[in-house]
Amino acid sequence: KFSKQSWGLENEALIVRCPRQGKPSYTVDWYYSQTNKSIPTQERNRVFASGQLLKFLPAAVADSGIYTCIVRSPTFNRTGYANVTIYKKQSDCNVPDYLMYSTVSGSEKNSKIYCPTIDLYNWTAPLEWFKNCQALQGSRYRAHKSFLVIDNVMTEDAGDYTCKFIHNENGANYSVTATRSFTVKDEQGFSLFPVIGAPAQNEIKEVEIGKNANLTCSACFGKGTQFLAAVLWQLNGTKITDFGEPRIQQEEGQNQSFSNGLACLDMVLRIADVKEEDLLLQYDCLALNLHGLRRHTVRLSRKNPIDHHS
């Protein structure tokens, strides 16, 4: 559970944080799990422990293995494991999957690519950035603090981005590289004030006493993924769950995406065994998102059964 994978390249710096956290005042001891040998804290060693951090300056393939950290709190010794793998440098340009950090997505509005793990290192700007091993040049690319900003992102900007920086430890410099994939979301989503498609405002719905009835609240909220959107029913201004009538329940319908790409939601109100008193209630279909709330009110009226007498 408290285990973390870390990886790096030989002859580069690698700094690993203990998967268990703790107050800065807590002592942290590090061990090489295979031998149970304590990792020294003296900085003259190539591999040494510094509180919650384990530093390989620089890393060697032989350093690969599982390292145990024990955070000593006043009450418990909390154990974590760092699974470290150091790889040989590739001669060609391709970065293998096992060296890749998590993929990030961007769009025209948000195209930041953060340099993975950089916060663990003592580095100074600027960062160097590469895409598919080519140094990034041109005014569209801006290295800002620990991330890369791409202006006017296009589909062709998708690919593998590598950041390169220098870690400084007691005057000695060590190179670090980290690579992650960047994907471009081509659809441009937007949200708008909710539009209720059904029911119509102040609609009268005919129902038969003793039968079941369904009311559907359907609303659209914009295009693309919506951050916050909901449809729900209220009875006399009260949430269905709080109203306390087990015969009346709401049930989520399907997320709908119409041909025009709008993001819409349904909520079905099911009334079992309609009773006279149900006709006295006010049924509100509510649609809400970050823009606001829209309400359409429905009332029920008695539908006279068809007269079959001749």
Partner: antibody
Framework: QVQLVQSGAEVKKPGASVKVSCKAS????????MYWVRQAPGQGLEWMGA????????AFNQKFKGRVTMTADKSTSTAYMELSSLRSEDTAVYYC??????????????WGQGTMVTVSS | DIQMTQSPSSLSASVGDRVTITCSAS?????MHWYQQKPGKAPKRLIY???KLASGVPSRFSGSGSGTDYTFTISSLQPEDAATYYC?????????FGQGTKLEIK
Amino acid sequence: QVQLVQSGAEVKKPGASVKVSCKASGYTFTDSEMYWVRQAPGQGLEWMGAIDPETGDTAFNQKFKGRVTMTADKSTSTAYMELSSLRSEDTAVYYCTRAFDNDNDEGFAYWGQGTMVTVSS
Amino acid sequence: DIQMTQSPSSLSASVGDRVTITCSASSSVNYMHWYQQKPGKAPKRLIYDTSKLASGVPSRFSGSGSGTDYTFTISSLQPEDAATYYCQQWSSNPLTFGQGTKLEIK
């Protein structure tokens, strides 16, 4: 949401033992240590000890060591505190409690409702 | 054991008053936590790590301090603040609480 529900009030005779339970819900039981704090009538709070449900490791206030046993049942997400050789001064409300963030010890953020234990002959 | 001494043991103040409670540790601690307890209820965490406000706690509550001396402040006392307040250290085993400060509204 995080909930800690404790067993009901107990009346015990001096020399007896009492076992208080604390059922956790709303989070992964083995991710957080469970602590026990007691409060005698009209008095302040006193930390008794704690258990790590994942490993079974325990930590105690030396004042209670030898008299208190803490256990955890992972299958039911329940922690137990048993206090033996009861005396009248053990009459108190016993609380189970846990930190907000287990590793950073940011104070006791979640508390059970308390279990009143009365020791009387 | 680290002894925690709160002062005053009790106090009475009016709505709108600024109220300060101090907690003195018998040896240096790194952080202090503060709790509020009302009769018949479990304690409630108000301040953690000396000065951080717990989620959902009004901003009139604050904390400060370092070493052996810590302070808890209510900037503008409200009627619902009538309670007993406790400090607690988590720097050394056993974890210890102050004896409490009972706050009454005049």
